[in-house]
Amino acid sequence: KSSNEATNITPKHNMKAFLDELKAENIKKFLYNFTQIPHLAGTEQNFQLAKQIQSQWKEFGLDSVELAHYDVLLSYPNKTHPNYISIINEDGNEIFNTSLFEPPPPGYENVSDIVPPFSAFSPQGMPEGDLVYVNYARTEDFFKLERDMKINCSGKIVIARYGKVFRGNKVKNAQLAGAKGVILYSDPADYFAPGVKSYPDGWNLPGGGVQRGNILNLNGAGDPLTPGYPANEYAYRRGIAEAVGLPSIPVHPIGYYDAQKLLEKMGGSAPPDSSWRGSLKVPYNVGPGFTGNFSTQKVKMHIHSTNEVTRIYNVIGTLRGAVEPDRYVILGGHRDSWVFGGIDPQSGAAVVHEIVRSFGTLKKEGWRPRRTILFASWDAEEFGLLGSTEWAEENSRLLQERGVAYINADSSIEGNYTLRVDCTPLMYSLVHNLTKELKSPDEGFEGKSLYESWTKKSPSPEFSGMPRISKLGSGNDFEVFFQRLGIASGRARYTKNWETNKFSGYPLYHSVYETYELVEKFYDPMFKYHLTVAQVRGGMVFELANSIVLPFDCRDYAVVLRKYADKIYSISMKHPQEMKTYSVSFDSLFSAVKNFTEIASKFSERLQDFDKSNPIVLRMMNDQLMFLERAFIDPLGLPDRPFYRHVIYAPSSHNKYAGESFPGIYDALFDIESKVDPSKAWGEVKRQIYVAAFTVQAAAETLSEVA
């Protein structure tokens, strides 16, 4: 049940007052305001928007609003030397060139500073060679090519379709396979919904549309030149050769019209199966090289982008807590966009703006939250979560001691079908209870709760009558808070009915066609889905900041720990002989999970019964809840990924967007049958079980009675 705590205020200032103040019309107005020109990280336009937001948040009534700047490594195309890809004939003449820019959408023909499509942080280079089509360039796609089809990508330029996994993982896989260049393209099979027109007549990707994006493999490092520390005025910067996560081969994205011209000439091996075929009218031959008449033609990349240390600006707003000002609930989302940012990020930034306005309205009427709320407009998220990570690095000591929760607020919509939530298990009950109190915006669910429509449209695979809540992965600004610092985190947005394309994004993602009109005409004309997302995000922040007892249920962590232990055990049991040979046992992990379950249950009983009027005991119980997420942090981090320190969850090593449970054990077991030294490999599995079991047991003990 929602709290109605009075902190020197009249009782009307409760969650309902906060939610009733949120208005769809305001979100619409803010979205329009934020999307009229590009706001690329590191540009003057994005600095001006930061100052505008600072000014407006002050007007809305926050106690303080400051800009926090950092000088980080960014990447831009060369304005006078454009990037493109050619088909060259035997004489080296360019007989076909890919497009240099996306045809601008109607009404935006005269907008300046639209950055052409590029892969941020691609090195410069002009490699030429035969093409190999590598499907999605996933780990399993390269296994299929190299192991089953015996196709060698060494010295080849690979072409991969966007989708399924984070583009940085594709590039890393291509590098490891020996490729000398990567072409990324959007196949209509992944970015064109059947029966929908392409923009501007619908929300599908036109043939000239291209997805921008960074291709880093930062593994949580933040600025590539200052891993672990803020990129401030006195920072020591690594040389570019030692920078974290930079790709070593040229990479460039193209649209499907250009991809058609490259793929239609492909020869060599036929695709291994239908899962390698997209929707273009091409054979999807793997190669290497072109067929018959075109066998003497090659592909050449021309990449001239530059990496530059550039100033970025976060906006940090504070609404001081009345009772526990040293406890921070953070609502953050990014402000920088690739072009207009109609969905990513401004549909989220507009919601944050309205949430700030609502909180400000309550504050002006004399209300304060129990705990401090921090609002953040992050910069340079698109360049590797840089703004949020640098700020968290700068404030890590405060955050690890005072951070209660982080709620992320990037794109509010990626569809208009149902709610999508990814969060720590500690927040499951908060999300369930909140969505039961909110009205569903969905057609056919008038008068029904959001919980009901969400559960109907996206049911939990495990528990009937409950909605699906996913694991946190990465690819957004919660990463440093959750994966590095162990602060309970969550995110919510409206999504599509398109489970198979979970990690491919919506069709116009990161293209020039992601405009205000896209949202207003096709996704959410009434802005009712935006309002619902504002209510969910804002409601979570309100409850986290204002409830007397933190709305965390540690028993839900116990349930998932058992599920994750079962899952990793079953993966290991695919190798029964080796488990026997190397004496691999999961007993310690299951024992720790059992202990956690029992201790969490007893803690929950005490939580019901303790004297909430005793501020010392209240603070003690809340601290145990707040620090539970922190207890899953291993200070040494995961193998080769020192900034991923959460033992229960990490971004998948094969897809940054996806969350993996017990990632240390999972990675140790992955492809273990191919390891050259099985004894060493199984030894690492045993070590990871030990780390996981210890961590779960240690976390359980933080919930025990203190004395």
Epitope: I87, F96, Y257, K261, V282
Partner: antibody, heavy 120, light 112 residues
Framework: QVQLVQSGAEVKKPGASVKLSCKAS????????INWVRQTPEQGLEWMGG????????NYNENFKGRVTMTRDTSNSTAYMELSRLRSDDTAVYYC?????????????WGQGTTVTVSS | DVVMTQSPLSLPVTLGEPASISCRSS???????????LHWYQQKPGQSPRLLIY???NRFSGVPDRFSGSGSGTDFTLKISRVEAEDVGVYFC?????????FGQGTKLEIK
Amino acid sequence: QVQLVQSGAEVKKPGASVKLSCKASGYTFTYFDINWVRQTPEQGLEWMGGISPGDGNTNYNENFKGRVTMTRDTSNSTAYMELSRLRSDDTAVYYCARDGNFPYYAMDSWGQGTTVTVSS
Amino acid sequence: DVVMTQSPLSLPVTLGEPASISCRSSQSLVYSNGNTYLHWYQQKPGQSPRLLIYKVSNRFSGVPDRFSGSGSGTDFTLKISRVEAEDVGVYFCSQSTHVPYTFGQGTKLEIK
């Protein structure tokens, strides 16, 4: 809007050549192949071949190979089709048509047609 | 070459009544990506052909919903639910799965 404007009617003697033009507007010329299709009362619609304006790659119907040449000028978004060694049965209406690319892969826009008469 | 055979070649229809045209191909028109590139064109008297239906059953933009396409493999049908006066003309099926692209002989729709 997409438009294909063809050159005017031609009268040719047998054995001569004819070169027809097709000027495209309203879209990015290099993205879409241009097909040439002819129509006669006897044979109906007959696909002669196509050209990719982006790289100049051509694909000819075997029935016309050796007699047909397709070219393009990207600077003025114009495709050309030359048919040589004309015979009386080449008398037809010749259409250029844009190959619609994904999702159509059909001829989604046609020129107005050029009548070619081959007569001694 | 793929031979496209239409029937009937002439189709007299009463206004407001349905009409159906059949098209058969000499080989399967399923492309390796699973799509079937069978299209229907309409040619009104004195005009160029225009695309009506693409990939068996998808209406091209601006085409009234009384036109529908169906079929698979080698057998395809174009249906007009209620014929209107403006529908008079010749209807061609065509395939672009195999090179050379080929057309049916055409079906002349006229009003009774």
